[in-house]
């Protein structure tokens, strides 16, 4: 009888993570007597996957009925494959012996490659907000994919970005891989509603890429523009001064009125109006009783936006331009929720 040969017909097998891998092996003879074993890897560090002789291998099932001596099919199935199972598997025939069984003949090996989907990309932006015209960095990470080949693209509002750097780790062979990319984005005042998208394409995704998004509303700070104006006289001794706070984001804003440098009133932006671009406008009124002042008044609208240093705009109120009623220091009627009388 010809000497036993161990035949592994498949040089390689490709399996999706979570599925079952079938590793084929047949022997050409019933002799010598002794067990078949499966190993991952070769050499002294090889890992035992299945032993016909003994042991408990819950993930492994034999394809054929090994309780029949005439059966020479030693193929196995390994269930619930993960990227960690990738490697070269050897079907090895042993000859019964002591003190140990003796390796008699090995198959040529079957390389098991595992296709694993990348995790959903996670996009993160800078820790602190930035203002328009500044360049900010966004990172995108995805993990656990195999094989290594992967494509990553960045978009801002559907327009592909070109200023980014991508790394896939590790560089060498591995059971699975991770991708890390950093994109640079220049902010504009119109970016409150903008989105940055990281798109990952991989062979396991069948043409349906995974996307991770970041809203620039989390990143941008649009500082307000201020305009202080004097409204027409409402009564002979009253002037209405307004501070228009325009095009700011986020909403967190505190406004202080100063009269000749002295704090008159502080309020927080509440009932704001939203612009189409996502920024906010707000207006504060100040009702000034000019009859209470002998000299010109310098009114200052001071705004602290989103914890940033205050910006201000002033308006000089010419008292001499208004006739005064002697002894009149009566409070004028307060007609607006943001109005305040100054005496």
């Amino acid at each position: 009888e010809e000497e036993l040969q161990v035949i592994q017909p498949d040089k390689s097998v490709l399996v999706a993570a979570g599925e079952t891998a079938t590793l084929r092996c047949t022997a050409t003879s019933l002799i010598p007597v002794g067990p078949i074993q499966w190993f991952r890897g070769a050499g002294p560090g090889r890992e035992l996957i299945y032993n016909q002789k003994e042991g408990h291998f819950p993930r492994v099932t034999t394809v054929s009925d090994l309780t029949k001596r005439e059966n020479m099919d030693f193929s196995i199935r390994i269930g619930n494959i993960t990227p960690a199972d990738a490697g070269t598997y050897y079907c090895v025939k042993f000859r019964k012996g002591s003190p140990d069984d003796v390796e008699f003949k090995s198959g040529a090996g079957t390389e098991l490659s595992v296709r694993a989907k990348p995790s959903a990309p996670v996009v993160s932006g800078p820790a602190a907000r930035a203002t328009p015209q500044h360049t900010v960095s966004f990172t995108c990470e995805s993990h656990g994919f195999s094989p290594r080949d992967i494509t990553l693209k960045w978009f801002k509002n559907g327009n592909e970005l070109s200023d980014f750097q991508t790394n896939v780790d590790p560089v060498g062979e591995s059971v699975s891989y991770s991708i890390h990319s950093t994109a640079k984005v220049v902010l504009t005042r119109e970016d409150v509603h903008s989105q940055v998208i990281c798109e990952v394409a991989h062979v396991t995704l069948q043409g349906d890429p995974l996307r991770g998004t970041a809203n620039l509303s989390e990143t941008i700070r649009v500082p307000p523009t201020l305009e202080v104006t004097q409204q027409p006289v409402r009564a002979e001794n009253q002037v209405n001064v307004t501070c228009q706070v325009r095009k700011f984001y986020p909403q967190r804003l505190q406004l202080t009125w100063l009269e000749n440098g002295n704090v008159s009133r502080t309020e927080t932006a509440s009932t704001v109006t939203e612009n189409k671009d996502g920024t906010y406008n707000w207006m504060s009124w100040l009702l000034v009783n000019v009859s209470a002042h002998r000299d010109d008044v310098k009114l200052t609208c001071q705004v602290e936006h989103d914890g940033q240093p205050a910006v201000s705009k002033s308006h000089d109120l010419k008292v001499s331009a208004h006739p005064k009623e002697q002894g009149s220091n009566t409070a004028a009627e307060n007609t607006g929720s943001n109005e305040r009388n100054i005496y």
Epitope: E1, S29, L30, I31, V33, G34, P35, I36, Q52, K53, E54, L66, T67, K68, R69, E70, K96, G97, S98, P99, D100, D101
Partner: antibody
Framework: EVQLVESGGGLVQPGGSLRLSCAAS????????MHWVRQATGKGLEWVSA???????YYTGSVKGRFTISRENAKNSLYLQMNSLRAGDTAVYYC????????????WGQGTMVTVSS | DIQMTQSPSSLSASVGDRVTITCRAS??????LAWFQQKPGKAPKSLIY???SLHSGVPSKFSGSGSGTDFTLTISSLQPEDFATYYC?????????FGQGTKLEIK
């Protein structure tokens, strides 16, 4: 059902011959290593002979040159030709099947009695 | 040839007892050791192979252990049908050899 049935035992004079048969059913005999084991009355078990799937044969020292193990695949049968029998060969002879991969005995026949006496 | 030595040669025990029979090989036999049960006038029955694996249909009260030269057969809770003679056997190399047997009797 997997079964082994021995036959051919009996009374024989010293120096005589006897041929034991073992009919296998429920499996293909040629795919297994097959054995003969004997047991003298009131004594322990003694392995006698074996034949491998490739036709290779093995014997215990006391029967070498006198006993011959063989098989006939067409009849799915195992044989033990015993020549130059001695009184010490008196025993029940069992036909035994070797295990699937390690040749561990798994199936035994009921045995046939061989008596060598004048 | 490899010699197989069983101890004890005979053993008296009661129903419900746990008993252990030992078998020693004269040289390393890996774990190619089998245990058989034989009742008077009957053919032996295969219980255990490769020192610890139970043959199909053998109750789990039988267990085997050991490797190299020293082996044991344990019966966890004796029942009346377990009183018999037990043999160990090495089958790592020809000639296969048996122990002399251990007769398990009712006390």
């Amino acid at each position: 059902e997997v079964q082994l049935v021995e036959s051919g035992g009996g009374l024989v004079q010293p120096g005589g011959s006897l041929r034991l048969s073992c009919a296998a059913s429920g499996f293909t005999l040629s795919s297994y290593d097959m054995h003969w084991v004997r047991q003298a009355t009131g004594k322990g078990l003694e392995w006698v002979s074996a034949i491998g799937t490739a036709g290779d044969t093995y014997y215990t020292g006391s029967v070498k040159g006198r006993f011959t193990i063989s098989r006939e695949n067409a009849k799915n049968s195992l044989y033990l030709q015993m020549n130059s029998l001695r009184a010490g060969d008196t025993a029940v002879y069992y036909c035994v099947r070797g295990g699937v991969w390690d040749d561990a005995f798994d199936i035994w026949g009921q045995g046939t009695m061989v008596t060598v006496s004048s | 040839d490899i010699q197989m030595t069983q101890s004890p040669s005979s053993l008296s025990a009661s129903v419900g007892d746990r008993v252990t029979i030992t078998c020693r090989a004269s040289q390393d036999i890996n774990n190619y050791l089998a245990w058989f049960q034989q009742k008077p006038g009957k053919a032996p029955k295969s219980l255990i192979y490769t020192a610890s694996s139970l043959h199909s249909g053998v109750p789990s009260k039988f267990s085997g252990s050991g490797s190299g030269t020293d082996f044991t057969l344990t019966i966890s809770s004796l029942q009346p049908e377990d009183f018999a003679t037990y043999y160990c056997q090495q089958y790592v190399s020809y000639p296969y050899t048996f122990g002399q047997g251990t007769k398990l009797e009712i006390k």
